[in-house]
């Protein structure tokens, strides 16, 4: 590159204590240097601004990828909120239904327990009543034993 | 640093008025500047070449991070999503399971109305019945009287 | 820009072709370049360390907020997790329910048949009983028998 | 001290070639504009050639142009003349001096004799 | 290129006499004058740089003057080692060009 080229031989420009005028030559190689530094630089600069502006140009594109992404992770935080509470009313709302079956599980125990006494009531008048009949004076006017005599064999 | 230094003394060069020739000892001042300032360059463009690479690696590890963030973003989303999906699938199914047991109530509530006058019935009949025994012709073919009369009672 | 100058008038130091000495005002126009050249690199790389220093703090900045919004995402992804199990214990409980609801109906459905079978059972008895009581020997001693008969019917 | 020591010069035909050498050594070479000079037998001094002390400017007599070529070799402390298409009127001893600005050719080697002839 | 005129081409002297040896340019040099010595078989050797200035080791008996276009060599008491030829050369400008010299000879 112009900028790293070896400056090297003007160092030591006639180390001896004459004075010696400088050759036009040496101030033309001079001139070429830092006409070419100039060049460099300006190059560079060039270059420089361009890559920083590219740099910047993504940094905004970043910021903005950066509000969205957040947005996006806000709304998310938020669904997710509104989504906790719809399980939470979910939760109370099964929990609910669940004492509800619990209750009505209760409720259908006790009404069994009923329905074996109103069973067992109900097969004892059965057998009561078949004693009933058929204790009856044998009559051709009481047709109703035999029926009901069928009805409980 | 060399890109710093006071470069002012080439303002007077040559002290001699009459001079037409540029003295050795002043191109020498030059050619260091020129020198330095090439070095100072050379810093610099190293340099800032070396940030600039450090800063596009950064705004590329930025990027692929990004990327990840998004995707993350984008599965958290979409879980979300599901999730939202699941827990009205839950809200219906909760609300069938409510109706449901709303229902089974209702029959429950029936079933015991049911019950209570199935009770009032069979309470009449035992009544009758007992009253029907205790009024028959007292016969010792009738043992059961004693016996319904007890179970009544 | 000084960095921007035309340095072209280098090239042709010194009208005299024939001179090998460089004239004073020649080094004096390279001197005067230089120092140009060395103020605009000097404005360069401080406007440029400028920017890169920008740069760095807004590539600091991101990395914060990458992390913050990384360690947001984390936890939207834990808080989901819990949500999905959270929900995976609500449709567990919901199915518990829900089969309870049908053992319960199932359990209802039966003793609905049991309370028909026993209905049927209560009327039978009721229409023996009946046809009992009007087949009895007409006698004062049984009052029952008008108040069965209109129970009945 | 300062010395310099020419080589290479012998006959050559006419349209031949002949490089020339010249080693210095008790001062900074790399410092120094070098320049050969000829002086034809019985004749007066010529100046020929002569390099900038980083061997990129260079500059030649018209008689010379485009047939001879400096060079140098600071790494070597050595200057040389290429000479091709030589004539009879390029005999001459051939020296090598150092060339201070404006305080002239304070330094000579003691020559070397170039003869162009069929 | 500038044209160095060199006056007498050659010139009988004795010890002891005091001799000039001129130089004209055909163009203003200032001072960029410089004056050789050359004897038979040997290199030539700067005695005078810039017009007046002695080259280390030369004889102060030697001296230079003139500027501009016009300029003379002067040996004070010539000294037998003196007769030799001499060659002025300008270093204004390029091509570098020498005098056609002066041979000083013992009468």
């Known amino acids: 590159s112009r900028i790293d080229q070896d400056n090297s031989s003007f160092d030591s420009l006639s180390p001896e204590p004459k004075s010696r005028f400088a050759m036009l030559d040496d101030v033309k190689i001079l001139a070429n240097g830092l006409l070419q530094l100039g060049h460099g630089l300006k190059d560079f600069v060039h270059k420089t601004k361009g890559q920083i502006n590219d740099i910047f140009q993504k940094l905004n594109i970043f910021d903005q990828s950066f509000y969205d992404l957040s947005l996006q992770t806000s709304e998310i935080k938020e669904e997710e909120k509104e989504l906790r509470r719809t399980t939470y009313k979910l939760q109370v709302k099964n929990e609910e239904v669940k004492n509800m079956s619990l209750e009505l599980n209760s409720k259908l125990e006790s009404l069994l327990e009923e329905k074996i006494l109103l069973q067992q009531k109900v097969k004892y008048l059965e057998e009561q009543l078949t004693n009933l009949i058929q204790n009856q004076p044998e009559t051709p006017e009481h047709p109703e034993v035999t029926s009901l005599k069928t009805f409980v064999e | 640093s060399r890109i710093d230094q006071d470069n002012s003394s080439f303002d007077s060069l040559s002290p001699e008025p009459k001079s037409r020739f540029a003295m050795l000892d002043d191109v020498k001042i030059l050619a260091n500047g020129l020198l330095q300032l090439g070095h100072g360059l050379k810093d610099f463009v190293h340099k800032t070449k070396g940030q600039i690479n450090d800063i596009f690696q950064k705004l590329n590890i930025f990027d692929q991070s990004f990327y990840d963030l998004s995707l993350q973003t984008s599965e958290i989303k979409e879980e979300e999503k599901e999730l939202r999906r699941t827990t009205y699938k839950l809200q219906v199914k909760n609300e069938e399971v409510k109706n449901m047991s709303l229902e089974l109530n209702s029959k429950l509530e029936s079933l015991l109305e049911e019950k209570i006058l199935l009770q009032q019935k069979v309470k009449y009949l035992e009544e009758q019945l007992t009253n029907l025994i205790q009024n028959q012709p007292e016969t010792p073919e009738h043992p059961e009287v004693t016996s319904l009369k007890t179970f009544v009672e | 820009s000084r960095i921007d100058q035309d340095n072209s008038s280098f090239d042709s130091l010194s009208p005299e072709p024939k001179s090998r000495f460089a004239m004073l005002d020649d080094v004096k126009i390279l001197a005067n370049g230089l120092l140009q050249l060395g103020h605009g690199l000097k404005d360069f790389v401080h406007k440029t360390k400028g920017q890169i220093n920008d740069i760095f703090q807004k590539l600091n900045i991101f990395d914060q907020s990458f992390y913050d919004l990384s360690l947001q995402t984390s936890e939207i992804k834990e808080e989901e997790k819990e949500l999905r199990r959270t929900t995976y214990k609500l449709q567990v409980k919901n199915e518990e329910v829900k089969n309870m609801s049908l053992e319960l109906n199932s359990k209802l459905e039966s003793l609905l048949e049991e309370k028909i079978l026993l209905q049927q059972k209560v009327k039978y008895l009721e229409e023996q009983l009946t046809n009992l009581i009007q087949n009895q020997p007409e006698t004062p001693e049984h009052p029952e028998v008008t108040s069965l008969k209109t129970f009945v019917e | 001290q300062v010395q310099l020591v020419e080589s290479g010069g012998g006959l050559v035909k006419p349209g031949g070639s002949l490089r020339l050498s010249c080693a210095a050594s008790?001062?900074?070479?790399?410092?120094?504009?070098m320049s050969w000079i000829r002086q034809a037998p019985g004749k007066g001094l010529e100046w020929v050639s002569y390099i900038g002390s980083s061997g990129v400017n260079m500059y030649y007599a018209d008689s010379v142009k485009g047939r001879f070529t400096i060079s140098r070799d600071n790494a070597k402390n050595s200057l040389y003349l290429e000479m091709n298409s030589l004539r009879a009127e390029d005999t001459a001893v051939y020296y090598c001096?150092?060339?201070?600005?404006?305080?002239?050719?304070?330094?000579w080697g003691q020559g070397t004799l170039v003869t162009v002839s069929s | 290129d500038i044209q160095m005129t060199q006056s007498p081409s050659s010139l009988s002297a004795s010890v002891g006499d005091r001799v000039t040896i001129t130089c004209r340019t055909s163009q203003n040099i200032i001072n960029f004058l410089n004056w050789y010595q050359q004897k038979p078989g040997k290199a030539p050797k700067l005695l005078i740089y810039t017009t007046s200035t002695l080259q280390s080791g030369v004889p102060s008996r030697f001296s230079g003057s003139g500027s501009g276009t016009d300029f003379t060599l002067s040996i004070n008491s010539l000294q037998p080692e003196d007769f030799a030829t001499y060659f002025c050369q300008q270093t204004y400008s390029n091509p570098l060009t020498f005098g056609g010299g002066t041979k000083l000879e013992i009468k």
């Open positions: 001096a150092r060339d201070s600005s404006q305080l002239g050719f304070d330094y």
């Open positions: 008790g001062f900074t070479f790399s410092d120094y504009y």
